[in-house]
């Protein structure tokens, strides 16, 4: 029987700057029940405080709703392990708030086919940021990814849409019913999941572009 | 205990690349970013960008850009620096740094001497 | 890109004086999350940077007390209330609001 193994704080996420969540993970246990407390102070404080919630965020984490959320203050946190026989402590760990975003996934996907007279058809389309992120203070950029895939195919092919909302793809494969996605991170933050699947059917005389290129 | 171990000096020809290590430990390596700085003799830092190992995203410096790569093998917990088209101008330490969930660098490795010279 | 201006170039103490180092930066420092992101480093002789203060004021874990920071927009400064022999070193400032990031030029600090 020991003391507990060193444990280490190893993800903070944030679902809109409003609220965040971190997680660690256990040392060795030393064969005992071990009981864990993460406290913190936020920058220019000297004062520790408490997790305030170690349910939400599922077992061995620390959720700080809105009223302990602020980006304007770096957190230094640390994880205490302790059981009969001793206690041990994480590193310290920093948190800006700014940096641990990982938004939900964009919304209202939507895909069509266009086919002008005058030019090659192409698929375009569009969506909107998640509803939690505000995006007109400017501080918070949104980047986007999209893939796409014809439904019985084992590769995705991604392509980066940049601070977009809308995106045209111009080689296609003529017949195909085509799964389209889309996801978005901040520019120092984490990618979302991936939005769900929007269907889309390719018409058979869909002319394939010579060149596979996308456009903005 | 973080660690951040680079690879060992290097001499390198005008026009030819190098490829710097940088091997962590002590930590999960996805959790963090890790930045690329620069140091030529005498001079002060020049940062040359940063890549997030959790999914290799990277933001770089314009002026390295195209230039520099930053790859990370998460395997082995090895970050990589890949400078090409190389100039005497380019004779300096290279440093890896990791930040935490911040934007500033808690942890810094050794150093790697990049030498080039005709 | 944002340019770092520090003065003086170097600086000579006697052990147990006050030391002043000032950083200047071409534009604000205010990020649009209104932080500011200003840190100062040292390097000591023979070794990679340090980690001294982040975000203006605050010092690093393991940073001793005499060490301090303070400024705002454009004009920050890093104070060391009674220089110690162990010291020595280049101190640098850098900005992480703008990418890329930079640092300034570096002050080299002496014990007389």
């Known amino acids: 029987q020991l003391p507990p193994g060193k444990p280490e704080i190893f993800k903070c996420r944030s679902p809109n700057k409003e609220t965040f969540t971190c997680w660690w993970r256990p040392g060795t246990d030393g064969g005992l029940p071990t009981n864990y407390s993460l406290t913190y102070h936020r920058e220019g404080e000297t004062l520790m405080h408490e997790c305030p919630d170690y349910i939400t965020g599922g077992p061995n984490s620390c959720h700080f709703g809105k009223q302990y959320t602020s980006m304007w203050r770096t957190y230094v946190m640390m994880v205490n392990a302790t059981n009969q026989m001793g206690s041990s402590f994480s590193d310290e760990l920093y948190v800006d708030v700014t940096y641990i975003v990982q938004p939900d996934p964009p919304l209202e996907l939507t895909v069509e086919v266009k086919q002008p007279e005058d030019r090659k058809p192409y698929l375009w389309m569009k969506w909107s940021p998640p509803t939690l992120i505000d995006l007109k203070t400017g501080w918070f950029t949104l980047l986007y990814e999209i893939r796409l895939k014809p439904e019985k195919a084992a590769e995705w092919e991604t392509h980066f849409a940049g601070q977009q909302t809308e995106f045209k793809i111009l080689s296609l494969h003529p017949g195909q019913k085509y799964l389209v996605q889309v996801r978005c991170k901040p520019d120092h933050g984490y990618w979302s999941a991936w939005s769900p699947a929007t269907f889309i059917q390719i018409p058979s005389d869909f002319i394939m572009n010579d060149h596979h290129h996308h456009h903005h | 205990e973080v660690q951040l171990v680079q690879s060992g000096a290097e001499v390198k020809k005008p026009g030819s690349s190098v490829k710097v290590s940088c091997k962590a430990s002590g930590y999960t390596f996805t959790s963090y970013w890790i930045h690329w700085v620069r140091q030529a003799p005498g001079q002060g830092l020049e940062w040359i960008g940063e890549i997030d190992p959790s999914d290799s995203y990277t933001n770089y410096n314009q002026k390295f850009k195209g230039r520099a790569t930053l790859t990370v093998d998460k395997s082995s917990s090895t970050a990589y620096m890949e400078l090409s088209s190389l100039r005497s101008e380019d004779t300096a330490v290279y440093y890896c740094?990791?930040?935490?969930?911040?934007?500033?660098?808690?942890?810094w490795g050794q150093g790697t001497l990049v030498t080039v010279s005709s | 890109d944002v340019v770092m201006t520090q003065t003086p170039l170097s600086l000579s103490v006697t052990p147990g004086q006050p030391a002043s180092i000032s950083c200047r930066s071409s534009q604000s420092l205010v990020h649009s999350n209104g932080n500011t992101y200003l840190h100062w480093y040292l390097q000591k002789p023979g070794q990679s940077p340090q980690l001294l203060i982040y975000?203006?004021?605050n010092r690093f874990s393991g940073v001793p007390d005499r060490f301090s920071g303070s400024g705002s927009g454009t004009d920050f400064t890093l104070k060391i209330s009674r220089v110690e022999a162990e010291d020595v070193g280049v101190y640098f400032c850098?900005?992480?609001?703008?990418?890329?990031?930079?640092f300034g030029g570096g002050t080299k600090v002496e014990i007389k």
């Open positions: 740094a990791r930040s935490f969930f911040t934007n500033w660098f808690a942890y």
């Open positions: 975000k203006v004021s």
């Open positions: 850098s900005q992480s609001t703008h990418v890329p990031f930079t």
